[in-house]
């Protein structure tokens, strides 16, 4: 079936090796010759020619294909010129001949036993495979093609991606490095607890791929979608040469959704216990799972063992707020935390949602800060608050919000990083509500916002200014 892969080979006598320990040669004849007409003879330098046993297969509308599989592994030698020629037994003619090096005619069998599963991040796909000839896998490079699987359209998209797979593992990376510090002190980084804007995927699904002999990681896919994928391999062109082998049979995989869609938020108050919460879905039950990993890299032949996240009572503090499911587990500060939420709908369908991985020090939630105020002069307020965490004062940022009584909209102010207070000028003879919240956003610790402090009611009298 792989003959088409050798189409670019202009030699009438085409040869290929699957493992570089075998050799198959074939050629086609239009002429209707008797069986036994041809002999395929071969010889290495200074050796006596030998005949390779031929089989033939009739090809409709064309003629006959003659095929020889070298019978003995010892007859297949690398780095020596092999002289081949086809002799006609009945007529005095050498039908065709060529000289080749077995090490330059590789046509590897496709990788087999492909396993595919969601990676550690939403939109990631972890795949691993077995090489039919492991002894040559170091001398092969791989190519992957994949695309979204549309059950309504079995042919899939017209554009499929072909991605050369040179190396495995993106550079060992901490999930979500605190690049947010480059912006304003309290700018929102993309965090596992952050319900940020959905990224729209371009039609050509731009994605990154990295690979190793037996595993690779694709990122940039659409969480919650189904994908098909295929692999093929080719000699690396350095130690061994040849052509791309055929594609493996397609494998399909359903990627978990992005837990952002469930409003997943995880935090720790004590750097030991982690609590995760997400919106409870209507007519569905849900369960949280977690696992710890040491390093974020392609886990070769290693699939995570998800542990149960211990369920807490469901909370529903107000009618407007959606009901939350919560769970908690003990964590460690030396490993990355991965969260998975499984939602089971009434008919029993299970949907998985993956959170973005994080270190425990990236999910530290501060206690609600206390806000104190006093009026210095008419309408001129002096504000003061205690740092909820004296050990991270320089990494704590605050938001102060206030609104006039009877108003719906809040005005939000961000004091400088590490500030312990400030002044506020308000309109005369007016009533206000003030609230404060805090979060960690430094090089050592980060985390979600604390809850807003209880509203502080103030009556004042002048215009607003810091």
């Amino acid at each position: 079936q792989d003959v088409s892969l050798l189409a670019s080979d202009s030699e009438p006598l085409k040869c290929f090796s699957r493992t570089f320990e075998d050799l198959t040669c074939f050629w086609d004849e239009e002429e209707a010759a008797p069986s036994g007409t041809y002999q395929l003879l071969y010889a290495y330098p200074r050796e006596k020619p030998r005949a390779c046993p031929l089989s033939s297969q009739s090809m409709p509308h064309f003629g006959t294909r003659y095929v020889c599989q070298f019978p003995d592994q010892e007859e297949v030698r690398l780095f020596f010129p092999l002289h081949l020629w086809v002799k006609n037994v009945f007529l005095n003619q050498t039908r065709t001949q060529r000289v080749l090096f077995v090490d330059s005619v590789g046509l590897p069998a496709p990788p087999s036993i492909i396993k595919a599963m969601g990676g550690s991040q939403p939109g990631e796909l972890q795949i691993s495979w077995e090489e039919p000839a492991p002894e040559i896998s170091d001398f092969l490079r791989y190519e992957l093609r994949y695309g979204p699987r549309d059950p309504k359209n079995s042919t899939g998209p017209t554009v499929i991606q072909l991605i050369a797979t040179e190396t495995c593992c993106p550079a060992l990376q901490r999930p979500h490095s605190a690049s947010a510090l480059d912006q304003s002190p309290c700018a929102q980084p993309t965090m596992p607890w952050q319900d940020g804007p959905k990224q729209t995927s371009p039609s050509r699904e731009a994605s990154a791929l990295t690979a190793e002999g037996g595993s690779c990681l694709i990122s940039g896919l659409q969480p919650g979608n189904s994908y098909w994928l295929q692999l093929r391999s080719e000699p690396d062109g350095i130690s061994l040469g040849g052509s791309w082998g055929s594609w493996s049979l397609p494998v399909t995989v359903d990627l978990p959704g992005d837990a952002v869609a469930l409003g997943l938020q995880c935090f720790t108050l004590d750097l030991k216990n982690v609590t995760c919460q997400w919106q409870q879905q209507d007519h569905a039950s849900s369960q949280g799972f977690f696992y710890h990993s040491r390093a974020r890299c392609c886990p070769r032949d290693r699939y995570p063992i998800w542990e149960n996240c211990e369920e807490e009572e469901k909370t529903n503090p107000g009618l407007q707020t959606p009901q939350f499911s919560r769970c908690h587990f003990k964590s460690r500060n030396d490993s990355i935390i991965h969260i998975l939420v499984e939602v089971t709908t009434a008919p029993g369908t299970v949907h998985s949602y993956l959170g973005s991985p994080f270190w425990i020090h990236q999910a530290v939630r501060l206690p609600t800060p206390n806000l104190h105020w006093r009026e210095i002069s008419s309408g001129h307020l002096e504000l003061e608050w205690q740092h909820p965490s004296s050990w991270a004062a320089q990494e704590t940022c605050y938001q102060l919000r206030y609104t006039g009584e009877g108003h719906q909209d809040w005005k939000v102010l961000e004091p400088p990083l590490g500030a312990r207070g400030g002044t506020l000028e308000l309109r005369p003879r007016s009533r206000y509500r003030l609230q404060l919240r805090a979060r960690l956003n430094g090089p050592t610790y980060q985390g979600p916002w604390s809850s807003w402090s209880d509203p502080t009611r103030v009556e004042t009298a002048t215009e607003t200014a810091w």
Epitope: E31, A32, A33, P34, V89, F90, L91, N92, Q93
Partner: antibody, heavy 118, light 107 residues
Framework: DVQLQESGPGLVKPSQSLSLTCTVT?????????WNWIRQFPGNKLEWMGY???????SYNPSLKSRNSITRDTSKNQFFLQLNSVTTEDTATYYC???????????WGQGTSVTVSS | DIQMTQSSSSFSVSLGDRVTITCMAS??????LAWYQQKPGNAPRLLIS???SLETGVPSRFSGSGSGKDYTLSITSLQTEDVGTYYC?????????FGGGTKLEIN
Amino acid sequence: DVQLQESGPGLVKPSQSLSLTCTVTGYSITSDYTWNWIRQFPGNKLEWMGYITYSGSTSYNPSLKSRNSITRDTSKNQFFLQLNSVTTEDTATYYCARLGRRYTMDYWGQGTSVTVSS
Amino acid sequence: DIQMTQSSSSFSVSLGDRVTITCMASEDIYIRLAWYQQKPGNAPRLLISAATSLETGVPSRFSGSGSGKDYTLSITSLQTEDVGTYYCQQYWSSPWTFGGGTKLEIN
């Protein structure tokens, strides 16, 4: 033009050997092609007996149970059929023929009739 | 060995008739089939190779067809000189074998 001519005894006694010669003119039998012996029994049934190729390799019809051999004399541009231990069943007209480019018998001799009888 | 069967051993035909002679192999011979014509007192003469290829000098009223195990020789308009016995021969597998022959006679 290529011509083939069979020659040999018209009568052979049972259990003896039958020897026939095919003389080829107009083409060297060592240059190319494959040179065949075919016989036709009195009921008109045709039987392929064997060949010798331009290079001297031979092949025979297994039905003759190793009784026949085909050889050649390249200096005379002739090839031969020897059939041992003949019986009356071997009475036939013997033809020599060339296997041509299309692997079919494109040139035939006119045939020589052989009777096996005591 | 591959058996070649020509179902009719003889035909009585009229000049100008269309004649069809059939030949069946005991197994697939992949169009390795030749047709020969033999007139009384003469050696066989090659008409067709590879089931359908007409030899040089053979009149175009002769044609061959078929594949697999079943083959046919057709003569569109029978002439006097076409009288004789027709043989099929397979050359796919050794030993090469001939059909029993089909004799054409004029009514």
